[in-house]
Amino acid sequence: ESLGTEQRVVGRAAEVPGPEPGQQEQLVFGSGDAVELSCPPPGGGPMGPTVWVKDGTGLVPSERVLVGPQRLQVLNASHEDSGAYSCRQRLTQRVLCHFSVRVTDAPSSGDDEDGEDEAEDTGVDTGAPYWTRPERMDKKLLAVPAANTVRFRCPAAGNPTPSISWLKNGREFRGEHRIGGIKLRHQQWSLVMESVVPSDRGNYTCVVENKFGSIRQTYTLDVLERSPHRPILQAGLPANQTAVLGSDVEFHCKVYSDAQPHIQWLKHVEVNGSKVGPDGTPYVTVLKTAGANTTDKELEVLSLHNVTFEDAGEYTCLAGNSIGFSHHSAWLVVLPAEEELVEADEAGSVYAG
């Protein structure tokens, strides 16, 4: 069985839908990004206990590694987080979803290392240019997601202090050659391009020279286009709620989507005494969906007024776009009014929350 080879580039804090079982989803993140992997239950049925595994070893939750039954979040990703991730059923170890994650060096903002490699008097009487930090110039190919900032650096020295100029694909490169311009930081021997786009792909050459000689280094930039993805829902929303009979309740859902999302609020219901259809998928009714005059902001909140015991149950925020769907659910527990609780306590009854 061949593995899927689609290269999916995911922007910051992007939740990645789980691939079909048997397919390996190949994902690229920038360092510092939040890696979010999502593995919905196959067939929509109950998932059972799951474990997340990286390179064959079970992942241990921490402040940076957040593990849930259907989702894994790795905050502030670094190169060490690259590897093969899978979500498995705990008992059978059956692989439900499989991801290949690569964390690329996120280019710096262009400002965070200012002053590090400024031209210095090396004490050499005279001499041709040379690289002062060649170990920092090893990475000749840079692949970054679109909209990131790229910084190429060629720290050098010589006497007299050499000049630096830049070429793109062998031709002189100036700010007017790209939308958004460029920043040339001669003191830091750097070229900075903000918010890169696919047309920025190419070979970038720094030329460092003085009257005694010339050296050059070429970097290749590949700009990875963000592939469209299904909507992303903010973790933890909607949140479970407990309310007293007759009170008002609000569920919140925060949706991020490149393509225009279609948001719905669903209530899980019973039909003929069953919570699921013949095929095991939960019965739902649509409580709220987009209207001609409804804003996305309004749709991100479900308000329930004067709640009754019938309002208790499971609610789902469902967001869909042309690519697919994402959903998060929460429970509403409705408690009797306080005076009823008091009466019940006096009668010796016990309520389990």
Partner: antibody, heavy 126, light 110 residues
Framework: QVQLVQSGAEVKKPGASVKVSCKAS????????MHWVRQAPGQGLEWMGW????????NYAQKFQGRVTMTRDTSISTAYMELSSLRSEDTAVYYC???????????????????WGQGTLVTVSS | DIALTQPASVSGSPGQSITISCTGT?????????VSWYQQHPGKAPKLMIY???NRPSGVSNRFSGSKSGNTASLTISGLQAEDEADYYC??????????FGGGTKLTVL
């Protein structure tokens, strides 16, 4: 973009069966319900039923119960509709239509058809 | 067995506005805000024009609008154009969660 491509026209004899295919592309096949709707010559649209490509679950209109079978092959993103015991009044254009129903749920009274196949003409004639 | 009632035909001149009605019961149109409308040109597949009573999919002209009052949904086309000439169908649900269509309305642009 989303595309539903149906199989070609069929001519069948009364009593025979016909199987129409609908190949989906441009979206995640298992995320949306697939419906079948038919239209007899000069008549209106008639809903036949749906299949949930994710679970394989089906729901058929009362009129077609016992005669229609909807199946899918997720490996090739294709849905199928088979109608048996054909009679002349089954002569119609048969459409597959993607329903805006998320396939992880069974909806009560909700959804619409946001993409349609080009239609397959099935002629039943002796 | 058509569950929703539409006029068999309506007509209008270019630039005019026309309205097509779709009448059901409290078990279908009246019970849910989930009526949709489809346009069908001769020999072509239907095309979604309005969903959830009044929403337009992207790519559909804002000359098309939908509304609902009680058990009757309506499709209004303003600034009528020759290419609007087609059949129009409404769609909703019945209490068995079955999809129901209207009988269709033939729109003629004079």
């Amino acid at each position: 973009q989303v595309q539903l491509v149906q199989s070609g026209a069929e001519v069948k004899k009364p009593g025979a069966s016909v199987k129409v295919s609908c190949k989906a592309s441009g979206y995640t096949f298992t995320s949306y319900y697939m419906h079948w709707v038919r239209q007899a010559p000069g008549q209106g649209l008639e809903w036949m039923g749906w299949i949930n490509p994710n679970s394989g679950g089906t729901n058929y209109a009362q009129k077609f119960q016992g005669r229609v079978t909807m199946t899918r092959d997720t490996s090739i993103s294709t849905a199928y509709m088979e109608l048996s015991s054909l009679r002349s009044e089954d002569t119609a254009v048969y459409y597959c239509a993607r329903g805006y129903w998320y396939a992880y749920f069974t909806y009560i009274n909700y959804g619409y058809f946001d993409n349609w196949g080009q239609g397959t003409l099935v002629t039943v004639s002796s | 067995d058509i569950a929703l009632t539409q006029p068999a035909s309506v007509s209008g001149s270019p630039g005019q506005s026309i309205t097509i009605s779709c009448t059901g019961t409290s078990s279908d149109v009246g019970g849910y805000n989930y009526v949709s409308w489809y346009q069908q040109h001769p020999g072509k597949a239907p095309k979604l024009m309005i969903y959830d009573v009044s929403n337009r999919p992207s790519g559909v002209s804002n000359r098309f609008s939908g509304s609902k009052s009680g058990n009757t949904a309506s499709l209004t086309i303003s600034g009528l154009q020759a290419e609007d000439e087609a059949d129009y169908y409404c769609q909703s649900y019945d209490n068995n969660s079955d999809v129901v269509f209207g009988g269709g309305t033939k729109l003629t642009v004079l």
